[in-house]
């Protein structure tokens, strides 16, 4: 029985050319994290394996990096990166949680944190 | 190689208590769940649970819950069953066996050669 | 809980068979179902999982297949040392066991 929920850092907005950190947390549920994936849309971004550690696609190698722990770091922003981001958490023995993230992107310096939420 | 040796069998009375050993070697210990599993004699395969080996929360399958404790020893990477209050239906031969993943999918392997606890009085 | 049923129970057949061994689950698992074989006094043997998909080393005579409800296990042709128990195990929701298939020489 999932009894879990992940939190996350909800709506976010960045300026062009800088960074944002992209996390997601795991609670209430006994599970353990086998496997994170970070996915935007429907490309994989990077995955972190409870044993092998992190692998960051090769199509984002130069503007992706890992962590701080579970979460994504996204640097040099373009206007392109604004959408959809999904922490996919792969657990045992609960199966699959979900988190999703909406990073916007702005050219000017009027970029705000968004407040967080949870999705169950 | 990935292995987990467990402890010899044991042959106690009825009421008394017996704790088994689980210990793996060739991977790293806290990145895999670990699993107890129940097979009494001419019997299938029973699960009694698991024990999540990052944070030491052992979850207990129905009918596995009172008498029955998993623990671990993560500096020495081992995993225990204990059981308390012996009765001659525990009977049986204990395996432990690690979770191994791929994505989302799970299966048990590999698997100790088990522990035959005999309770007889 | 989501039961599994094996069918047969068990089966007897010769070296160079082709044998099937069906699991029924009470409920839909997806393909979270995976295999094992298991020789007496021994510890079980992982083979398949993902319902279909072969653990490395195991041969290639070993096949699953199956989706939601009904899923089977095949031997293309039987060789001696496959004689055993078979279980079905699901990983969807609380895991459990089928009951096992014993596998005998005729």
């Known amino acids: 029985m999932m009894t879990g929920t992940i939190e996350t850092t909800g709506n976010i907005s960045a300026e062009k050319g800088g960074s944002i950190i992209l996390q997601c947390h795991l609670s209430s549920t006994t599970a353990q994290v086998t496997q994170v994936n970070w996915e935007q849309q429907d490309q994989l971004l990077a995955i972190c394996n409870a044993d092998l550690g992190w692998h960051i696609s090769p199509s984002f190698k130069d503007r992706v990096a890992p962590g701080p722990g579970l979460g994504l770091t996204l640097q040099s922003l373009t206007v392109n990166d604004t959408g959809e981001y999904f922490c996919i958490y792969h657990t045992y023995p609960d199966g699959t949680y979900t988190g999703r993230i909406f990073l916007e992107v702005l050219e000017s310096s009027v970029a705000e944190h968004g407040a967080r939420f949870q999705i169950p | 190689e990935v292995q987990l040796v467990q402890s010899g069998s044991e042959l106690k009375k009825p009421g008394a208590s017996v704790k088994v050993s689980c210990k793996a070697s060739g991977y790293t210990f806290t990145s895999y769940p670990m699993n107890w599993v129940r097979q009494a004699p001419g019997q299938g395969l029973e699960w009694m649970g698991w024990?999540?080996?990052?944070?030491?929360?052992?979850t207990y399958a129905q009918g596995f819950t009172g008498r029955f404790v998993f623990s671990l020893d993560t500096s020495v990477s081992t995993a225990y069953l204990q059981i308390s209050s012996l009765k001659a239906e525990d009977t049986a031969v204990y395996y432990c066996?690690?979770?191994?993943?791929?994505?989302?999918?799970?299966?048990?392997?590999?698997w100790g050669q088990g522990t035959l606890v005999t309770v007889s009085s | 809980d989501i039961r599994l049923t094996q069918s047969p129970s068990f089966l007897s057949a010769s070296v160079g068979d082709r044998v099937t061994i069906t699991c029924r689950a009470s409920?839909?698992?997806?393909?979270?179902l995976a295999w094992y074989q298991q020789k007496p006094g021994k510890a079980p043997k992982f083979l398949i999982y993902?319902?279909?998909t072969l653990q490395s080393g195991v041969p290639s005579r070993f096949s699953g297949s199956g989706s939601g409800t009904e899923f089977t296990l095949t031997i293309s042709s039987l060789q001696p040392e496959d004689f055993a128990t078979y279980y079905c195990q699901q990983l969807n929701s609380y895991l459990t066991f089928g009951q096992g298939t014993r596998l005998e020489i005729k």
């Open positions: 066996a690690r979770t191994g993943y791929s994505g989302s999918y799970y299966w048990f392997d590999p």
């Open positions: 024990i999540n080996t990052n944070t030491g929360n052992p």
């Open positions: 993902a319902a279909s």
């Open positions: 409920q839909g698992i997806s393909s979270y």
